[in-house]
Interface confidence: low
């Protein structure tokens, strides 16, 4: 656990009158209907709302759109639905923010049925004006941003035409035709899947991987029986076909789709899938489904070229393509994972990795809680925590875990303590350390937020009835105080800060209702005056990352380093402020045999830091396919795990020889590929 | 106050032993890590050997490996340092420092070794 | 093993000189860096830790700065009682935690 304070609760002094001084409150002029918040820009304090509201007529739907901007985090808005000429706005394309702080904005209006093409309204200004464009298509996606260069603009049209604007939408090319999908790579570089035959379902399976490094003047085609492609870090990712049945396997690459290796995974059928979980410049976690529907998978981890796995989680709840799966990474701590399996007898149990994927383990049980009735020994059971699969399954748990980067070690969650995930009414749950340890800090279920890197956490109670109280802790969680913010409950949709949780504002959104009529509403709460002055040096202790044995030298070292970082004293009631940054001071490790992971062929017993042998492989020459050529590895059963930093220490050998053979691969080998020009 | 007195130093024969002491006091000796520095006659300091805070890990430089053993009493509040097969390079005075790992915060007075026939 | 190069090797200032020694490492420690000064048949003093945290007592005009490989320990008004020898340490990973040769500094 993270340095602890004195267990007392003292109360922030005045808190009502300074939060009833820093409450605004915004009735929108609207029916009820749906409601779509954006932030444009970081630190800018400017809010983009579309409410939109469905009149079903006898023949047809009219609808209507109100755009709304504010500039002070939400204190105050003005309705621009002017600026987009009173168009109705199309919700399903949302609104397509700029990357960075390019104040960039396009919204997608609806058009009549007999237009040549549909019209978007395009920002520059972090939407203070709007320039209304009609386009030579009919968009099918939402328009994306090139992450290099925010001019750059692609989209898919209806009749599955690939278009590019070079200058922020104001002109359109197509640069193909009969694509089915494409994503921005790094560089300005567009990858798309395109069909030759009938269409993208009939020829999935069948499709070729192109890709254009000028936006279009020219083009290469990178693989062919292509199922479907993704990006992840410096990986780029292909499931192909297999020459002689219906299975596809997956092939990697780190060179743009240059080279191609084979990923030594399982081969799937028709009814399983892939599924990249997380990916970083270093590694992927891969989830391979297992045959029939089984609801679950494994969990496999990369070597640094993304080309040999490791097994890393048996039995990973994932329920189909595209379906439900819990696994998060915890942003607060380096290394760390959550996720759940689904056991033999069907309960659903949550496990943890704080090593990247190297072992998963059972949450430890919240000290101030009891096991429930899914526990066979009261005494002994774990933390399960409720993600996405619990919300796709309606259970009372109105949000996923949560935790941000720059609150470190903070970990918020609903769950349940016992064998297994439970069914009943989940409670809040907290960690202020990277998920080692875990306190029960809310009963229920609640919204929750995490505002001023830490600093105030705030929550409101999930329930059907209206609602007119907010609760904060200015302690990580420890202490709660309640705020009324209006003496009219309403009813809640949804809180809001702006991402990042750097600000000190919240929004309550809700609405009214009455005898005719139902406004849109929203409470924005600026919390600067409970935290009065600025947080010093005295505020801040320091604190190990990954600590479990303070009597090791080694201790706290996760993939070969270890972080000592600044965090704010539990006691502190000040602002880290809107500039904060994470202090951390790393230190390299000796290497152990925790630092390597299990090479192709062998495998960790349960228990064990040693690798062994695969007994199917043994006495086998351990071939793998690696740019289209066969590779003999010489391997005494470790390598490096990915972004391992450790030094000196122990040093297993791993050596890779050419075989000089061709793999059977079912991509075109790089000398074969061919390119075109426009 | 922060104490450190280190004792034990003397003369010794080149091949010989001696096992020198340091008593601490002023502070939860059981907490930190501690450490051994050496400074020969006109030189600079040289780090010989530190101990985790309950006696389970040690660390030495790859040339004093084998000879030198560092070791504590938590209840007597003590470090030690057990020199073996003393060489004249082995010869200066000898410092315990208190450790908690970013620094060497406390310093003892130093007791001087010296290895000759 | 880390190699740190303090320079200069010795330096001659006067009273209210301001003062610069450096110590170079060879590979990035990430501000894992002490300063410590030493008097003649003294035991050394922690001045700095963590490349630019002052130690508890250690007059403000001391002041150490640095990230990377190159770090910095500043005397801003030099008063007689800081003639003496100053050392850098680094504190990376795991040892061995090197010491840079020293600095003296006399009086000029």
């Known amino acids: 656990s993270a340095p602890g304070e004195d267990e007392e609760c003292g109360r922030v002094r005045d808190f009502v009158a300074k939060l009833a001084n820093n409450t605004h409150q915004h009735v929108f002029d609207d029916l009820r209907g749906s409601v779509s918040l954006s932030w444009v820009g970081d630190s800018t304090g400017v809010i983009l709302v579309l409410t939109t509201f469905h009149v079903p007529l006898v023949i047809m739907t009219f609808g209507q759109s109100k755009l709304y901007r504010s500039e002070d985090y939400g204190k105050n808005f003005k309705d621009i639905t002017d600026l987009i000429n009173n168009t109705f706005i199309r919700t399903e394309f949302g609104m397509a923010i700029g990357p960075e702080n390019s104040g960039k904005v396009v919204l997608t209006a609806e058009v009549s049925g007999g237009s040549r093409g549909g019209r978007i309204f395009r920002s520059s200004d972090f939407a203070k004006n709007f320039v209304q464009t009609d386009l030579p298509f009919h968009p099918l996606t939402q328009m994306m941003y090139s992450p290099q260069n925010s001019d750059y603009l692609l989209a898919l049209s209806t009749e599955n035409g690939l278009w590019v604007s070079k200058n922020f939408g104001g002109k359109w090319e197509e640069i193909h035709k009969a694509v089915c999908l494409a994503k921005w790579g790094s560089d300005n570089t567009i990858f798309f899947t395109t069909y030759a035959n009938g269409s993208c379902k009939a020829d999935l399976g069948a499709l070729e991987l192109w890709r254009t490094s000028d936006l279009g003047k020219s083009f290469k085609t990178i693989g062919v029986k292509i199922y479907s492609f993704g990006l992840g870090g410096r990986f780029l990712f292909a499931s192909v076909m297999a020459d002689k049945d219906t299975t596809r396997r997956i092939h990697v690459s780190t060179d743009q789709g240059d080279t191609w290796s084979m990923a030594q995974l399982p081969s799937v059928g028709q009814e399983q899938f892939y599924s990249i979980l997380a990916a970083n410049d270093d590694m992927v976690f891969m989830h391979v489904d297992e045959p029939g529907d089984t609801g679950f998978g494994t969990i496999f981890t990369s070597d640094d070229r993304g080309i040999v796995y490791s097994k890393s989680l048996d039995r990973h709840l994932y329920t189909t393509t595209g379906g439900e799966t819990d696994f998060t990474n915890v942003t607060s701590l380096r290394g760390v994972y959550i996720t759940s399996v689904l056991s033999e007898d069907n309960s659903i149990q949550t496990m943890i990795t704080f090593d990247q994927g190297g072992r998963w383990t059972h949450l430890r049980k919240p000290e101030n809680s009891e096991c429930d009735a899914t526990a066979k020994n009261k005494n002994e059971c774990s933390l399960h925590i409720h993600a996405s699969y619990s919300i796709s399954q309606k259970l009372n748990v109105p949000m996923a875990p949560l935790s941000e980067p720059n609150a470190v070690g903070i970990v918020i969650a609903h769950g349940s303590v016992g064998d297994a995930i439970s069914v009943m009414v989940p409670d809040v749950y907290i960690s202020d350390d990277g998920g080692y340890s875990w306190t029960k800090m809310l009963e229920g279920p609640h919204y929750y937020t995490i505002l001023d890197s830490g600093g105030i956490i705030v929550a409101i109670e999930h329930s059907s009835r209206p609602i007119n109280v907010i609760k904060f802790s200015t302690d990580e969680g420890q202490c709660w105080q309640t705020y009324t913010f209006t003496r009219d409950p309403i009813y809640f949709t949804g809180l809001a800060s702006e991402p990042g949780a750097r600000s000190m504002n919240i929004s309550i959104w809700g609405f009214t209702e009455s005898f005719l009529t139902s406004q849109w509403v929203s409470y924005t709460i600026d919390f600067k005056d409970i935290l009065e002055r600025n947080c010093e040096e005295k505020d801040y202790t320091i604190w190990l990352a990954h600590s479990t044995d303070p009597e090791d030298y080694e201790d706290g070292c996760i993939l070969g380093y270890k972080e000592q970082f600044l965090r704010l004293r539990k006691s502190s009631v000040c602002q880290n402020g809107r500039d904060y940054v994470v202090t951390k001071q790393p230190s390299i490790c000796l290497c152990s045999l925790e630092d390597f992971l299990c090479d192709f062929g062998y495998y960790r017993p349960e228990n064990d830091s040693k690798c062994v042998e695969q007994p199917e492989l043994k006495g086998h020459d351990l071939e793998f396919c690696l740019y289209g050529r066969e590779e003999h590895l010489t391997t005494n059963g470790y390598r490096k795990i990915p972004g391992d930093k450790c030094q000196g220490g122990v040093n297993p050998v791993r050596e890779v020889k050419d075989l000089k053979k061709k793999c059977t691969s079912n991509f075109l080998s790089p000398e074969k590929q061919n390119s075109k020009s426009n | 106050e922060v104490q450190l007195v280190e004792s034990g130093g003397g003369l010794v024969q080149p091949g010989g032993s001696l096992r020198l002491s340091c008593a601490a006091s002023g502070f939860t000796f059981n907490i930190y890590g501690m450490s051994w520095v050496r400074q020969a006659p006109g030189k600079g300091l040289e780090w010989v050997a530190t101990i985790s805070s309950g006696g389970i890990y040690t660390y030495y430089p790859d040339i004093l490996k084998g000879r030198f053993t560092i070791s504590r009493d938590n209840a007597k509040n003590s470090l030690y340092l057990q020199m073996n097969s003393g060489r004249a390079e082995d010869t200066a005075v000898y410092y315990c420092?208190?450790?908690?790992?970013?620094?060497?915060?406390?310093w003892g007075q130093g007791t001087l070794v010296t290895v000759s026939s | 093993d880390i190699q740190m190069t303090q320079s200069p090797s010795s330096l001659s200032a006067s009273v209210g000189d301001r003062v610069t020694i450096t110590c170079r490492v060879s590979e990035n420690i990430y501000s894992n860096l002490a300063w410590y000064q030493q008097k003649p048949g003294k035991s050394p003093k922690l001045l700095v830790y963590?490349?630019?945290n002052i130690a508890d007592g250690v007059p403000s005009r001391f002041s150490g700065s640095g990230s990377g490989t190159d770090y910095t320990l500043t005397i801003s008004s030099l008063q007689p009682e800081d003639f003496a020898t100053y050392y850098c340490?680094?504190?990376?990973?795991?040892?061995?935690?090197?010491f840079g040769q020293g600095t003296k500094l006399e009086i000029k």
């Open positions: 420092a208190r450790h908690p790992g970013g620094a060497m915060d406390y």
């Open positions: 963590a490349a630019t």
């Open positions: 340490q680094h504190f990376w990973g795991t040892p061995p935690w090197t």
